[in-house]
Amino acid sequence: ASTGETPNLGEVVVAEVGWDALKLNWTAPEGAYEYFFIQVQEADTVEAAQNLTVPGGLRSTDLPGLKAATHYTITIRGVTQDFSTTPLSVEVLT
């Protein structure tokens, strides 16, 4: 269990946008999180979000399997054993 305040995420940036995939970069303090929880939600639909997690040591991930010419809202949270950060979001058009 952590003591004191868990730091929040810095910023999230869509680094590369492809036809049906994109690359997500973010900043976060080293060693602060066990993993990052990422939700990829198609904008303006009630379709379920695609969820994935990446290890806490990473600051970048590819998001494959997206639709072309589609608006997405991407949300990322840092997670420890007993804490989850406020989500950071970014919008993108593939």
């Epitope: 993993y35 929880f37 969820n51 994935l52 054993q81």
Partner: antibody, heavy 121, light 107 residues
Framework: QVQLVQSGAEVKKPGSSVKVSCKAS????????ISWVRQAPGQGLEWMGA????????NYAQKFQGRVTITADKSTSTAYMELSSLRSEDTAVYYC??????????????WGQGTTVTVSS | DIQMTQSPSSLSASVGDRVTITCRAS??????LGWYQQKPGKAPKRLIY???SLQSGVPSRFSGSGSGTEFTLTISSLQPEDFATYYC?????????FGQGTKVEIK
């Protein structure tokens, strides 16, 4: 050592609901996803959905969307799977599991003992 | 949802044989792929995680390989206790999905 202990066997009528519990002990509960997997007699494994208790976010397989609800009680380290509108095809063994990959990349893989649900009129 | 196509659905082999089972993903996935062994009346047991990492306590005759869309489980020299049903599980992009299973029977 992590242990997942499930509730006992159930016999249900078609159209009713069943709620199966899965109590975790011996490890962190909140930040790891608990999945539910079922296996009908003589059939393969079928992933139904999962929840990360600390986030309160559940994910469901499309096949079960609208019929299954997965919840978690952090205070008792217990996850629940409720399946409604039961039909005979829902007769199966239901497993809870903490699977590698979805929420945390440790090399763990723990399964409950399974709960047999029989749907019969 | 990502579809996992596992082949073959069943195979007959003899003790000492080399056995290969394949799983194909309908789209590229990260290495979040596991291989499971299940015997009748028992919960599944994981053999391989992260596509190629051997689960602690699992004999080294089991190995996994692959990335992207194609993954393979190999049993280098089949033993009597290996006759069982094997499943792959894609667990990186939610919802997770299992392959249909491969039953390994005695020839």
């Amino acid at each position: 050592q992590v242990q997942l202990v499930q509730s006992g066997a159930e016999v249900k009528k078609p159209g009713s609901s069943v709620k199966v519990s899965c109590k975790a002990s011996g490890g962190t509960f909140s930040s790891y996803a608990i999945s539910w997997v079922r296996q009908a007699p003589g059939q393969g494994l079928e992933w139904m959905g999962a929840i990360i208790p600390i986030l309160g976010i559940a994910n469901y397989a499309q096949k079960f969307q609208g019929r299954v609800t997965i919840t978690a009680d952090k205070s008792t380290s217990t996850a629940y799977m409720e399946l409604s509108s039961l039909r005979s095809e829902d007769t199966a063994v239901y497993y809870c599991a903490r699977l590698y990959g979805y929420a945390y990349y440790g090399a763990f893989d723990y399964w409950g003992q399974g709960t047999t649900v029989t749907v019969s009129s | 949802d990502i579809q996992m196509t596992q082949s073959p659905s069943s195979l007959s082999a003899s003790v000492g044989d080399r056995v290969t089972i394949t799983c194909r993903a309908s789209q590229g996935i990260r290495n979040d792929l596991g291989w499971y062994q299940q015997k009748p009346g028992k919960a599944p047991k994981r053999l391989i995680y992260a596509a190629s990492s051997l689960q602690s306590g699992v004999p080294s005759r089991f190995s996994g390989s692959g990335s992207g869309t194609e993954f393979t489980l190999t049993i280098s020299s089949l033993q009597p206790e290996d006759f069982a049903t094997y499943y792959c599980l894609q667990n990186g992009l939610q919802p997770a999905t299992f392959g249909q299973g491969t039953k390994v029977e005695i020839k």
